[in-house]
């Protein structure tokens, strides 16, 4: 019989219900925005905005300062007071729409939903390792701003994204705001604009460049700005917007907008459609060719990637990649496939596609009928003409006008659908050693820290834990402070180490020591932990073998048993080859001689399951007693594996030595031609791994084996005669003298 060790699911080596408590701060209201600052003198701060209030926290998340940012019109509003005596606009709550650092000063800039979306600049004042905010400066000059032209109106109540770029000794605010007809009519924020902060911090320079959704499209064409970032020579905005100005406005897709970070102008504004799909390795019947589209971006982050992922993406290590979490629609719930998918768009590739798109539009020969696009921002036109014009005039350049690139950039889910039902609501990507890790917040208030690789059919978790008991969604914006990430959920801010909150969710020594080096996990006798958790017994270099099962559970006291041991950390090498003298198995007092691995039995074990098998031949010593005993596996002097060496002992109870007894055999005669069904009765007849009924030295083919009975078919006899009949268990004869008589057929 060919018994095989049962598979252990890979998930059994970890427990994601383990509770981790990470430092947190209760903000006293729903967190609306959060940003971090790290100075060069070890001073750092976390700025947390809620309705009508801005908190300044130290690196330990303790409150350092708190500032009233509303309600507008309230005498207690500290930011409002910076604008001089009011009234400055209609009274009302201030919801923070923008919270960014101006890298030039440094200073914090906050912009809210009240007071026409104006901003306030707070110089940073280091005090030891903490930072305080100086009295706010009101970035609003009343005499420069009108409802139809307001350089100081930055934030839209519908949402605004800002990236601040330092150019020379000046700060340029790259601003993208969601608009509708009502918002556009009230102190006219623009869809996309570049604003220069005035030297005296009294507001923004009056001459600023902007693009806005044309009035006729404001009602039907809504652009949501999901993320913005600056890398290299460009600032990028990521949007979710209707795929067409003329078609169904609920048919959405995702675009990347690119603006120059070195020339503060919008002539080289470019857009590119980002296409993210789930393409299962085995396509279902009826599933769309090329995979299922996930057109709506939920969150995004750009980061340099580690060596392994870089190789898989065919780019150089350290290159910047835009990662996006996409869903099928605004509600996020798909029909089939995972709830969330993650696609990776290398920035260099994005730039190349955009540049090629510009060439197609502007270089002869231009494909007839190729549109410049962006008809919601500008008059329709065909390439290479400028917007609204029939032809290029000599002093204009095709390249100096906004353009939608005619091709899209398509990518497939890095996780191959493995996020399953998880709804990702926050994303931050870091490079740790040569590993790229996605830190994701979820709809149900969990943090998933997962290695970003595309070649596997399972997720490589750093951690998966619940931030708290509220189960509220983790918010979109994540900030980094040193070796920690700050996530917001509900009214709380949580500080999560980038290397994971701990190691206790790894349940086995092998899984513990196979964890990434950056996690700092070690084995503490019977649990996985970081050194500070168990300084006494903590070690990272070896694991004992772990026996989980063996077969059979009993063997004959005389004769041998082929024992199969199941468990983990037997070999550390897939081949399962055991160097001489490293593995010692004893059953009771008796040794069990290791057997060479039968290469014909080797089968690939998928990483989602794991099990190791070890076989040995058990020959009980003469001193061995009948009865229950332990199986013990000791491994010593094993050469180290990639992550650790195997060293130690594992003991499992439940083996019994038994003495088989043969009580009766019938019938005691049969035809010489053979085929008589013999029934042997006794006790412990099924112990061990081998048994044989011999009739005159020839095997009687066993048809059934049980503890009390064996059935076999006699072999043909040479002559009519009485011949010896014996039972061997494990190669040793069971006591008793029996004969079988062959008769004429």
């Amino acid at each position: 019989e060919d018994w095989q060790c049962p598979r252990t699911p890979y998930a059994a080596s970890r427990d994601f219900d383990v509770k981790y408590v990470v430092p947190s701060f209760s903000a006293g209201g729903l967190v609306q925005a959060m940003v971090t600052y790290e100075g060069d003198r070890n001073e750092s701060a976390v700025f947390v905005a809620i309705r009508n209030r801005l908190h300044v926290l130290g690196p330990d998340l303790k409150s350092v300062q708190s500032l009233a940012t509303g309600p507008a019109g309230d005498p207690g509003c500290q930011t409002c007071a910076a604008c001089g005596p009011g009234p400055h606009g209609p009274p009302g709550d201030t919801d923070t729409k923008v919270l960014v650092l101006d890298p030039a000063l440094p200073a914090l800039v906050s912009c809210g939903s009240s007071l026409q979306g104006r901003c306030f600049l707070h110089d940073l004042e280091p005090q030891g390792t903490a930072v305080h905010l100086a009295a706010p400066a009101c970035l609003f000059s009343a005499h420069h701003n009108r409802p139809d032209d307001c350089p100081d109106c930055v934030a839209s109540p519908l949402g605004t994204r800002v990236t601040v770029v330092e150019q020379g000794q000046a700060s340029y605010f790259y601003v993208a705001s969601s608009l509708d007809a009502a918002v556009a009519a009230s102190f006219s924020p623009r869809s996309v604009s570049i604003r220069r902060l005035k030297a005296d911090a009294s507001g923004f320079a009056p001459g600023f460049v902007a693009l806005s959704v044309l009035p006729k499209h404001l009602v039907s064409y809504s652009i949501e700005y999901v993320h913005s970032f600056h890398t290299g020579a460009f600032v990028y905005f990521l949007t979710v917007q209707p795929a067409s100005v003329t078609d169904d406005p609920s048919a959405l897709h995702t675009r990347l907008a690119r603006l120059s970070a070195t020339e503060p102008e919008l002539g080289d504004y470019r857009e590119l459609v980002l296409d993210c799909r789930f393409a299962p390795k085995r396509r279902r019947r009826g599933a769309p060719e090329g995979g299922q589209p996930y057109p709506v971006l939920r969150v995004a982050h750009s980061a340099p990637v580690g060596a392994q992922l870089a190789t898989e993406l065919s780019i150089a290590e350290g290159q910047e990649v835009l990662f996006g979490v996409f869903v099928t629609g605004k509600d996020g719930g798909p029909g089939v496939g995972p709830n969330s998918v993650v696609c990776a768009f290398p920035i260099d590739l994005l730039d190349t596609l955009i540049d090629e798109g510009v060439e197609r539009c502007c270089e002869s020969p231009v494909h007839p009928g190729l549109r410049r696009g962006l008809d919601f921002f500008q008059s329709p036109s065909f390439c290479p003409n400028p917007p609204g014009l029939e032809a290029l005039s000599p002093n204009t350049s095709c390249r100096h006008f906004p353009l939608l690139v005619s091709s899209s950039f398509s990518r497939v889910d890095l996780f191959n659908g493995l996020l399953g039902p998880v709804q990702v609501t926050a994303l931050y990507v870091t490079r740790l050693d040569n590993v790229t890790v996605a830190h994701m917040g979820t709809m149900d208030g969990r943090i998933l820290q997962v290695e970003l690789v595309r070649s596997l059919n399972y997720l490589l978790y750093v951690s998966n834990f619940s931030l708290g008991d509220s189960g509220q969604p983790v918010q979109r914006d994540v900030s980094r402070l040193g070796d920690h990430l700050l996530f917001a959920s509900g009214d709380q801010v949580f500080q999560v180490p980038i290397q994971g909150p701990g190691c206790r969710h790894f349940l086995t020594c092998g899984r513990c020591l196979r964890a990434w080096h950056f996690m700092g996990c070690g084995w503490c006798g019977n649990m996985c932990g970081q050194q500070k958790e168990c300084p006494g017994s903590w070690q990272q270099d070896h694991c004992p073998p772990k026996l989980t099962e063996f077969h059979p559970h009993s063997g004959p006291l005389r004769g041998s048993t082929r024992l199969t041991l199941c468990g983990s950390n037997f070999y550390l090498h897939p081949s399962g080859l055991v160097p001489e003298g490293t593995h010692q198995v004893t059953v009771g007092q008796s040794p069990c001689r290791p057997l060479p691995k039968d290469s014909s039995k080797l089968r690939p074990v998928p990483r989602k399951d794991f099990v190791e098998e070890f076989e040995c031949e058990l020959e009980p010593l003469g001193t061995q007693a009948v009865g229950p005993t332990n199986v013990s596996l000791t491994v010593t002097n094993m050469p180290p594996g990639k992550h650790f060496r195997v060293d130690g002992t594992s003991v499992l109870r439940g083996f019994s030595f038994m003495e088989p007894v043969l009580i009766a055999v019938q019938p005691l005669f049969g035809p010489r031609a053979g085929g008589t069904c013999l029934t042997l009765e006794g006790q412990s007849l099924s112990v061990g791994t081998s048994r044989a009924v011999l009739v005159n030295g020839t095997e009687c083919l066993l048809a059934r084996v049980s503890e009390g009975q064996l059935l076999c078919a006699t072999p043909p006899g040479a002559t009519v005669a009485s011949v010896p009949l014996s039972l061997q268990v494990g190669g040793a004869q069971v006591p008793g003298s029996w004969t079988f008589q062959y008769r004429e057929d």
């Epitope: 060069d40 001073e43 030039a104 000063l105 350089p151 000794q169 000046a170 030297a199 009056p206 001459g207």
Partner: antibody, heavy 117, light 111 residues
Framework: QVQLQESGPGLVKPSETLSLTCTVS????????WNWIRKPPGKKLEYIGY???????YYNPSLKSRVTISRDTSKNQFSLKLSSVTAADTAVYYC???????????WGQGTLVTVSS | DIVMTQSPLSLPVTPGEPASISCRAS??????????MNWYLQKPGQSPQLLIY???NQGSGVPDRFSGSGSGTDFTLKISRVEAEDVGVYYC?????????FGGGTKVEIK
């Protein structure tokens, strides 16, 4: 009140490296831009370059190959190094602070450096 | 680089009288609706001090008698009523393009 004070040798030999330090008091170099400007005899003020609070630098292209500006936040100082000097580098060297747009609101007293063998 | 030209080179003044210094840039120094022109005064034996930034904004602690105007390429610094302490060399500086560049200076002295 922010005060700046230049220090360094007043005489440097040709082909050697001119090194000056600007010590800032009454304010921190962890904010704003920290500039070097020079005035050769009988010539216009010439902008050399800056280092920002974050360590970002800019150098005048005419001097770029020879200039290094660095800072030491623990001492609240920033420094200028100008290599391979010639007599044309003889000037009064000033350090200055600006908050925005190269508008320098605080200046050091200036130090005369003569390049001569 | 943008070349800055000041005139006059020397300006004898009478206390209590107005005075005016001109500065011309070799190209427009306006952008974003702002003129990137700064004015400095270097008093005898002292380092320069910022008088005017962005063409018309007074520096911190600068007396009201100093004002700046102009746009494009032509700019003017006015002293409404000269005082004895106003003597020294006045410099204009553009900061629209890098490197920032200075005028040659105008020496103001009491008649």
């Amino acid at each position: 009140q922010v005060q700046l004070q230049e220090s360094g040798p007043g005489l440097v030999k040709p082909s050697e490296t001119l090194s000056l330090t600007c010590t800032v008091s009454g304010g921190s170099i962890s904010s704003g831009y920290w500039n070097w400007i020079r005035k050769p005899p009988g010539k216009k003020l010439e902008y050399i370059g800056y280092i920002s609070y974050s360590g970002k630098t800019y150098y005048n292209p005419s001097l770029k190959s020879r200039v290094t500006i660095s800072r030491d936040t623990s001492k609240n100082q920033f420094s200028l190094k100008l290599s391979s000097v010639t007599a044309a580098d003889t000037a009064v060297y000033y350090c200055a602070r600006s908050k925005y747009d190269y508008a320098m609101d605080y200046w050091g007293q200036g130090t005369l450096v003569t390049v001569s063998s | 680089d943008i070349v800055m030209t000041q005139s006059p080179l020397s300006l004898p003044v009478t206390p209590g009288e107005p005075a005016s210094i001109s500065c011309r840039a070799s190209e427009i120094v306006d952008n974003f609706g702002i003129s990137f022109m700064n004015w400095y005064l270097q008093k005898p034996g002292q380092s320069p001090q910022l008088l005017i930034y962005a063409a018309s904004n007074q520096g911190s602690g600068v007396p009201d008698r100093f004002s700046g105007s102009g746009s494009g390429t032509d700019f003017t610094l006015k002293i409404s009523r000269v005082e004895a302490e106003d003597v020294g060399v006045y410099y204009c500086q553009q900061s629209k393009e890098v490197p920032p560049t200075f005028g040659g200076g105008t020496k103001v002295e009491i008649k």
